[in-house]
Amino acid sequence: SSCGQVKCRKGEQCVHTASGPRCFCPSPRDCESGCASSPCQHGGSCHPQRQPPYYSCQCAPPFSGSRCELYTAPPSTPPATCLSQYCADKARDGVCDEACNSHACQWDGGDCSLTMENPWANCSSPLPCWDYINNQCDELCNTVECLFDNFECQGNSKTCKYDKYCADHFKDNHCDQGCNSEECGWDGLDCAADQPENLAEGTLVIVVLMPPEQLLQDARSFLRALGTLLHTNLRIKRDSQGELMVYPYYGEKSAAMKKQRMTRRSLPGEQEQEVAGSKVFLEIDNRQCVQDSDHCFKNTDAAAALLASHAIQGTLSYPLVSVVSESLTPERTQ
C-alpha cells in the first residue's frame, strides 16, 4: 500500500505517525520475514519484528551490532598457558595426545599438527580463529592468513553427488562433466586440460607413512583427498629429469626415542635405514579454483597450515606426519 513517499511491501500497512508515515506489519505471517536473508552473523539468532527492518538479532558474545557484525574485544585476559607438566613431558614425542592438543600447548608441541606449532601464526584477526572451527561462518576468520575459517563461509558445502564414480574416474585423462565441480575436485582437471596451469607459489613437502610404491599406486586418491581439504587441485612435482618427486623416507626418531637410545642398546632388528614412508613434493594448480572461487591459495604457506589444522581436528584420511611449505625449488633431500 502507498504511504506518501514510503513504499510499503506486501502485507504491510501504512500508519501515519507523528514522525511521518511508517510501514507496519499487522501479522508477521503475511509479511516477508526480515530473517529470510539470515542477516544475523556469527551465530546470532534472528527474531522477526513488525517494523523495519523486520528482524532483530540476539548476538552471541563477543559480537554486537544490528547484525552481530561488530566484534567487541572482551576485557583483556592473559593468554592461556600450557600449565600441565603432563603436556610438557608429552610434547614433541611424535604422538598426538588429545589432552595437550590446544593452542596454549602448541598442539602438543606440533605432535597433533604435522609438526607445525602454530598454523595460525599469520592470522591477525582479533578472534582466536582456531577456536572458531564451528561449522558456521566467522567473517573475521575468513582470510587466507586465518585459513579461510576452515572453508566454513562457502555456504552449505555441497558434497560430491557421484562420489564413488568421481573418485574412480578422478584424473584419468577423460573429462566427466558430472564430476567437474569444486566438490568433486574438478575431475582432477580432466576437463581443463586445454587451459593453462595456474600454479601457486612454492611447494608442499609432505611426509606420509606409506612407502613410495604404495603412495604412487594410490596417488590419485591421495591427491583427491588433500585437494578436497584445500578446495583446489594438487599434483606431484617433477624434478629436472621429469621424474615424480616421491622419495623414500627413513624416519626421524623422535626426541623421546633418541633419549631412550642413549640409555639402552639398540634392540635386535632396529634398523636406522628402514623405509618408514615417503617424502612427497606437491604443487597446487589453481586453474579451476580461480574460476569458481575467491578462496584459492596464492602460495603454499597457508595450504600447509590448513593441512595442519585438519590434523589438529583429526580429519586427515592419510597418515601424514609432517607438512612444510618450501618457497624455493628444493634439492633432493631426505
Partner: antibody, heavy 122, light 107 residues
C-alpha cells in the same frame, strides 16, 4: 585381514621376567599405535602401555612404570612387552590392541589379539 | 588419573528389551569415549568410538550418546548374542582408563 597374535605368556615366579610378543599383519605396522591391555581373572580391563612404532614414543600406567618396557621391531611387524620384577598382582590375560588413529594415542582400540595368560605364582 | 564409573554393574534383561548402560567420567573428556563388548574367554570388541560413532560392522541397535562427563550406551532391542560384559573407556588422557564393566545377563 588385520590380525594381532600374542605369544610368550606362561607361569613365572614372583620377581621373575617374561617377554610377550604381538605379531601384527594386514596393515602398515609403523603407522598405528599399539597398546597392551590386561585383565586379571574375573576382573575388568586395565590399560598397561602404549607405543607408536614410527616415533618410538612410549607411555606406561603407573602400576608398571619402571618394571615393564614396551618396544617394537618394525622390520618384524612385532610389538613386545618386557616384564621384569613380576608380582602376583600382574597375573592376567594380556592383550595387544591396535589404536585406530595413526599417531593419535587419543584413539580407540579397533583390533585386538586373542590374549596370552601370564601367571605369577610361587 | 581420570576415573570412569559405570552403572549398573550388572543387569538382567530379556530378548527384545531396551537396555541402557551409563558411564560417568571424573572430569571432562569431551567425546573421547569408547564402548567395548566382551564375551567370556574372548578379546574385547570395539562397538562405539567418539562417544557415538558405530564401528563398521556393528549392528544399528547399538548406539552411544553423551559428551563431557556423562555417556550412555543403548541397545534398542536386545538380541541373544548381546549377552556379554560391556566396558566404557576414556582415551582423552593417558593413562586410558576403563569403567568396571556392566554384565548383561538373561532374565
Amino acid at each position: 585381514e588385520v590380525q594381532l597374535v600374542e605369544s610368550g605368556g606362561g607361569l613365572v615366579q614372583p620377581g621373575g621376567s617374561l617377554r610377550l610378543s604381538c605379531a601384527a599383519s594386514g596393515y602398515t605396522f609403523s603407522s598405528y599405535g599399539m597398546s597392551w591391555v590386561r585383565q586379571a581373572p574375573g576382573k575388568g580391563l586395565e590399560w598397561v602401555s602404549y607405543i607408536y612404532p614410527y616415533s618410538g614414543a612410549t607411555y606406561y600406567a603407573d602400576s608398571v612404570k619402571g618394571r615393564f618396557t614396551i618396544s617394537a621391531d618394525t622390520s618384524k611387524n612385532t610389538a613386545y612387552l618386557q616384564m621384569n620384577s613380576l608380582r602376583a598382582e600382574d597375573t592376567a590375560v594380556y592383550y595387544c590392541a591396535r589404536h585406530s588413529g595413526y599417531y593419535r594415542i587419543s584413539s580407540a582400540m579397533d583390533v585386538w589379539g586373542q590374549g596370552t595368560l601370564v601367571t605369577v605364582s610361587a | 588419573d581420570i576415573q570412569m564409573t559405570q552403572s549398573p554393574s550388572s543387569l538382567s534383561a530379556s530378548v527384545g528389551d531396551r537396555v541402557t548402560i551409563t558411564c560417568r567420567a571424573s572430569q571432562n573428556i569431551k567425546r573421547f569415549l569408547a564402548w567395548y563388548q566382551q564375551k567370556p574367554g574372548k578379546a574385547p570388541k570395539l562397538l562405539i568410538y567418539g562417544a557415538s560413532t558405530r564401528e563398521s560392522g556393528v549392528p544399528s541397535r547399538f548406539s552411544g550418546s553423551g559428551s563431557g562427563t556423562d555417556f550412555t550406551l543403548t541397545i534398542s532391542s536386545l538380541q541373544p548374542e548381546d549377552f556379554a560384559t560391556y566396558y566404557c573407556q576414556q582415551y582423552y588422557r593417558s593413562p586410558h582408563t576403563f569403567g568396571q564393566g556392566t554384565k548383561v545377563e538373561i532374565k
